[in-house]
């Protein structure tokens, strides 16, 4: 947010940049929260655009019984590991195929015990205000599905008739991490000392961090013909004077006709 200055007054302007604004030789370069020739005005909306997607990561352990552990499986670049990874990934893609939020699996470690597979199940959803609920539900379905498959796909007579077989008791969910996104908190932080007056409103499921000086929202302050200006004590209406009227009042809704005042008469609209 910059305002260019030309002429003799510029040097004076330079020393008068307010609110942390810096002079670049032509204009005041204003910090995010401010605008105007001297950075004297507080913006009425702050971009807190959410990420397009929110991710979750589930740390799981399953025990694969249809493969015997060999030392080569510790080496992630070995043919053995690569083949195991391919089969395991294909198997998990089948297991979680009904979950729209499912992205894939990432094997972190293979260890002895048949083959104990430490891995992450990766989930992702489009950002909406309900993303936490969506991902919570998805993690529950993941738990259900992996429990079901590790109970059903088991070795019979030392042979697996499925793509992979599992130890029913070897399935554990270690940890669930969801990317945190709190628009209200972000809005408060970015509004700094004006945080008490900025709020989050949603439009088309997208959050907007706005002060009452931003028009078009439910919290918007109607200053009528005046101008809404933010101060440390909150939003205020700066009322205007026209050729014919003075405006006053909390929302500049009281107009006084000048001619009537000069004629010692007051008239309110």
């Amino acid at each position: 947010r910059t305002t260019t200055c030309f002429g003799d007054g510029c040097q004076n302007t330079a020393s008068r940049c307010k609110n942390g604004g810096t002079w670049d030789g032509l204009k005041c370069q204003c910090p995010n929260l401010y605008y105007g020739e001297l950075c004297e005005e507080v913006v009425s909306s702050i971009d807190i655009g959410p990420p397009e997607t929110i991710s979750a990561q589930m740390e799981l352990t399953v025990t694969v019984t249809s493969v015997k552990f060999t030392e080569e499986l510790k080496n992630h670049s070995s043919q053995e590991f690569q083949e195991f990874k391919q089969t395991f990934t294909e198997q998990m893609n089948i297991v979680y195929s009904g979950i729209p939020e499912y992205v894939g699996v990432n094997i972190t470690k293979l260890r002895l015990g048949s083959v104990v597979v430490e891995h992450d199940v990766l989930l992702r959803t489009k950002y909406t205000p309900e993303y936490k609920t969506v991902l919570d539900n998805a993690t529950e379905v993941v738990k259900e599905k992996i429990t079901k498959v590790t109970t059903q796909q088991i070795m019979i007579n030392d042979i697996c008739s499925d793509m992979m077989c599992f130890n029913t008791t070897g399935t554990q969910v270690q940890n669930i991490t969801v990317t945190q996104y709190d628009p209200e908190e972000d809005c408060r932080k970015m509004a700094k000392e004006y945080g008490d007056y900025f709020v989050v409103e949603y439009r088309d499921q997208k959050p907007y961090c706005i002060s009452p000086c931003e028009p078009g929202f439910s919290v918007s302050k109607n200053c009528n013909l005046g101008k809404c200006q933010m101060s440390l004590s909150g939003p205020q209406c700066l009322c205007v004077t026209t050729e014919t009227h003075w405006y006053s009042g909390e929302t500049c809704n009281q107009g006084t006709q000048k001619s009537l005042v000069y004629g010692h008469h007051h008239h309110h609209h």
Partner: nanobody, 123 residues
Framework: EVQLVESGGGLVQPGGSLRLSCAAS????????MSWFRQAPGKEREGVAI???????GYADSVKGRFTISRDNAKNSLYLQMNSLRAEDTAVYYC?????????????????WGQGTMVTVSS
């Protein structure tokens, strides 16, 4: 590159015998697992027998006691001795390989395949 070439298929009478061979190249044959699968016309591919590098062998119930799987690591070869053949054994027989020590007779668990050899059991 892994290459598997089957041979030994043919026409045999019910009750007869046949020995299938699979010549392997492009990998360390002595490691991992080898197996035989078969696919009858109009049916899904099914596991027949498996042998691992540790010597473990496993068989489908339908061939137990009649078929024997073996390997010769020096010759990079896999074999399937088929005795007491029945009409229902008629199928294309495939050799499959894995770098893993597998205990699975599901085709989805196997990554490397030969082209197959036809076995017809008929009088």
């Amino acid at each position: 590159e892994v290459q598997l070439v089957e041979s030994g298929g043919g026409l045999v009478q019910p009750g007869g015998s046949l020995r299938l061979s699979c010549a392997a190249s492009g990998f360390t044959f002595s490691r991992g697992s080898m197996s035989w699968f078969r696919q009858a016309p109009g049916k899904e591919r099914e596991g027949v027998a498996i042998i691992s590098s540790d010597g473990w062998t496993g068989y489908a119930d339908s061939v137990k006691g009649r078929f024997t799987i073996s390997r010769d690591n020096a010759k990079n070869s896999l074999y399937l001795q088929m005795n007491s053949l029945r009409a229902e054994d008629t199928a294309v027989y495939y050799c499959a390989a894995s770098f893993l020590v597998l205990r699975a007779l599901n085709p989805k668990a196997w990554h490397y395949w030969g082209q197959g050899t036809m076995v017809t059991v008929s009088s």
